[in-house]
Amino acid sequence: LGCDLPQNHGLLSRNTLVLLHQMRRISPFLCLKDRRDFRFPQEMVKGSQLQKAHVMSVLHEMLQQIFSLFHTERSSAAWNMTLLDQLHTGLHQQLQHLETCLLQVVGEGESAGAISSPALTLRRYFQGIRVYLKEKKYSDCAWEVVRMEIMKSLFLSTNMQERLRSKDRDLGSS
């Protein structure tokens, strides 16, 4: 990805998804009525013209926001502590890797706008999730809906990372 982002970063992302899956506490079928459109900014992860700075920034902000969301008293009360600790550790490792990368990308002179713009958009998205949890009084179903929403958005963000990685491989082999 144009910096020494360890090869296991993709593996860590997949582990995060696995952990989020394992964290399930109730049947999602009980929560159909609680579905909500959080308006995940799909255009941010779906583009074909991927810039390193943009990808790094999206992934960093996503992981930072997930870390914050699952690092609260409310979250500790809702989830299995062992799995939650593993999630915190994995997210922390990924954030450290990405911060190293972001510093290098900025050093290479990539646009600051490519970094700040996705961060603002994602903060608004996560704020909507926090408002929803509060509205729903942090119910089990609200957390379940949020867990599945985070899995979806993280999956899409990880896909974007993989697309950039394969684009870099193609350029390297040509």
Partner: antibody, heavy 121, light 108 residues
Framework: EVQLVQSGAEVKKPGESLKISCKGS????????IGWVRQMPGKGLEWMGI????????AYSPSFQGQVTISADKSISTAYLQWSSLKASDTAMYYC??????????????WGQGTLVTVSS | DIQMTQSPSSLSASVGDRVTITCRAS???????LNWYQQKPGKAPKLLIY???SLQSGVPSRFSGSGSGTDFTLTISSLQPEDFATYYC?????????FGQGTKVEIK
């Protein structure tokens, strides 16, 4: 390209068992639920039940609870609908369709081509 | 269960006509999770509109959806020859998921 491909038409006798399949491709199979819908000849659509292939959790319509069994094998991205003892009234077209689970996205955005089940003595 | 009632059950219209189909739920669909499907003979249903008013990708803009709570509408602004089919509404708000009985749009 997202696809749901169903098994072929079946002709069975009353009392026989049957298992039809729906194979998903072109997307993450465990990220979506699979629903089953019945359409009797010349009639409308009836939702039968649904499965979360990630852990095989199921939910059924009260009209079909105990009449059919929905299962899935995520290793081969396939969902199943089965009967232990068919009746003539089970004659219908059966569709599988993809559902986004608790995520906010279109319900049943992709459908299988349908499996025609004919039960006759 | 939430009962979905469509009206009319069938209608005859000409190419170019504006067609409106209504769907009434027996109780409020609070998050507007109401979908519309088109089905042609011998084919699987096809999603047209989701969340009451969002047009599914690839569906022509002559199709539109509106409504909230218990009353929803599918409108075809200018009927085309390929639009002659049966249309179903479906609520995705609560179990069991339920469909309307269908509205058959025929050529006048």
């Amino acid at each position: 390209e997202v696809q749901l491909v169903q098994s072929g038409a079946e002709v069975k006798k009353p009392g026989e068992s049957l298992k039809i399949s729906c194979k998903g491709s072109g997307y993450s199979f465990t990220s979506y639920w699979i629903g089953w819908v019945r359409q009797m000849p010349g009639k409308g659509l009836e939702w039968m039940g649904i499965i979360d292939p990630s852990d095989s959790d199921t939910a059924y319509s009260p009209s079909f609870q105990g009449q059919v069994t929905i299962s899935a094998d995520k290793s081969i991205s396939t969902a199943y609908l089965q009967w232990s003892s068919l009746k003539a009234s089970d004659t219908a077209m059966y569709y599988c369709a993809r559902h986004p689970g608790l995520n906010w996205a279109p319900d049943f955005d992709y459908w299988g081509q349908g499996t025609l089940v004919t039960v006759s003595s | 269960d939430i009962q979905m009632t469509q009206s009319p059950s069938s209608l005859s219209a000409s190419v170019g006509d504006r067609v409106t189909i209504t769907c009434r739920a027996s109780q409020s669909i609070d998050n507007n999770n109401l979908n519309w499907y088109q089905q042609k003979p011998g084919k699987a249903p096809k999603l047209l509109i989701y969340a009451a008013s969002s047009l599914q990708s690839g569906v022509p803009s002559r199709f539109s959806g509106s409504g909230s709570g218990t009353d929803f509408t599918l409108t075809i602004s200018s009927l085309q020859p390929e639009d002659f089919a049966t249309y179903y509404c479906q609520q995705g708000y609560d179990w069991p998921l339920t469909f309307g009985q269908g509205t058959k749009v025929e050529i006048k």
